[in-house]
């Protein structure tokens, strides 16, 4: 009987663990290339897929171009941004490019915005080469509160690689705040 009880307790424990894991918030958002904005300086990317291809979201919300935290916790945030130019893509006005990504946190309760992560480089993409490519990956561990919003800003959005395996960002909760 004691062994049976232990088995039942164990299975309940597994179930509780599993349901807790299933409730763990996460998001992986991929660029919606049909709606990339204009600009050359810092431009906010507001159009992302959350439910097609590799894109998925659970217990977080995507609204108005921002990823909204629904549960307090420590989260791992990441972003991968690829820039590319091919001689058939369009006409480059300059070879000198600042290719940057900024991951920003906005708090609604106390209206404020903070850059959590940034990455990138200045590049010289000469016309002597028919193809140019540059990738940026940033990631970090942050304490986030419910209602806080994560957004992505980039420079030179017209040079973004529109593939789902190239330009994406996401988050997953690692643990509760004690």
């Amino acid at each position: 009987i004691r062994a049976e009880k232990a088995m039942v307790d164990g299975s309940w424990l597994d179930l509780a663990k599993r349901s807790k894991l299933e409730a763990q918030p996460f998001a992986h958002l991929t660029i919606n290339a049909t709606d990339i904005p204009s600009g050359s300086h810092k431009v906010s990317l507001s159009s992302w897929y959350h439910d097609r291809g590799w894109a998925k979201i659970s217990n977080m919300t995507f609204s108005n171009g921002k990823l909204i935290v629904n549960q307090d916790g420590f989260y791992y945030l990441y972003a991968n941004i690829c820039f590319r130019h091919h001689e058939t893509s369009g006409d480059l006005a300059t070879e000198y490019l600042q290719l940057m990504v900024y991951v920003t946190k906005t708090s609604i309760k106390i209206p404020s915005s903070h850059t959590l992560m940034k990455g990138g480089s200045t590049k010289y993409w000469s016309g002597n080469s028919e193809f140019h490519f540059y990738s940026i990956n940033v990631g970090g561990f942050f304490k986030l509160r419910s209602g806080e919003e994560i957004s992505i800003e980039v420079s030179n959005p017209s040079l973004l690689d529109p593939d789902q395996d190239a330009t994406y960002f996401g988050a997953f909760k690692v643990r509760d705040i004690d």
Epitope: S38, H85, G90, A93, T94, Y96, G127, N156
Partner: antibody
């Protein structure tokens, strides 16, 4: 003050050649892509050529490709347009224009005063 | 090539009036449309870019709107000095193309 001043316009016979110049001042010339835009006698505007800030990319519409060559000398803050095999339909006021905006989607934010090219026998 | 069509070659208006000039693209150009003003005997001047952004120093009576294929340029209260030809231009792709121009006459 940002200024673009074109020169070199003239009366030339069909099949002839001409070189236009554009002197830039009041801004860091080497940071900007530049273009030539022409205005025909019926007042239509037509993009003619573009060169990137460092000079390694050049672009032309089909109407002038192979006949016109855009170039620049960043040390002299000067833009050029070498025109050859000129046709009567090349008769126009030629403007030098600075590019603004961003890659692939640039527009013309500053225009010069223009120089007149007349192709006639 | 993308064709930009300004249906009105001439438009007549009075000082203080609101006037709108339209421009239609032969295919989707997103919001990549610029508007230029050319006064008699002068070179063109940029007023609006990316459909709705006013260029530096342009008075706020000039506005632009639209996306896709249909674009509008509006002067909210026409002044005597606004007598000019107004051109739209797509800056979506090359070759860059212009509309035929709309000549604004002041009554």
């Amino acid at each position: 003050e940002v200024q673009l001043v074109e020169s070199g316009g003239d009366l030339v016979k069909p099949g002839g050649s001409l070189k236009l110049s554009c002197a830039a001042s009041g801004f860091t010339f080497s940071r900007y892509g530049m273009s030539w835009v022409r205005q025909t006698p019926d007042k239509r505007l037509e993009w003619v050529a573009t060169i990137s800030s460092g000079g390694s990319y050049t672009y032309y519409p089909d109407s002038v490709k192979g006949r016109f060559t855009i170039s620049r000398d960043n040390a002299k803050n000067t833009l050029y347009l070498q025109m050859s095999s000129l046709k009567s339909e090349d008769t126009a006021m030629y403007y030098c224009a600075r590019l603004d905006g961003y890659n692939y989607r640039w527009y013309f934010d500053v225009w010069g005063t223009g120089t007149t090219v007349t192709v006639s026998s | 090539d993308i064709v930009m069509t300004q249906s009105h070659k001439f438009m007549s208006t009075s000082v203080g009036d609101r006037v709108s000039i339209t421009c239609k693209a032969s295919q989707d150009v997103s919001s990549a449309v610029a508007w230029y003003q050319q006064k008699p005997g002068q070179s063109p001047k940029l007023l609006i870019y990316s459909a709705s952004y006013r260029y530096t120093g342009v008075p706020d009576r000039f506005t632009g709107s639209g996306s896709g294929t249909d674009f509008t340029f509006t002067i909210s209260s026409v002044q005597a000095e606004d007598l000019a030809v107004y051109y739209c231009q797509q800056h979506y792709s090359s070759p860059r193309t212009f509309g035929g121009g709309t000549n604004l006459e002041i009554k």
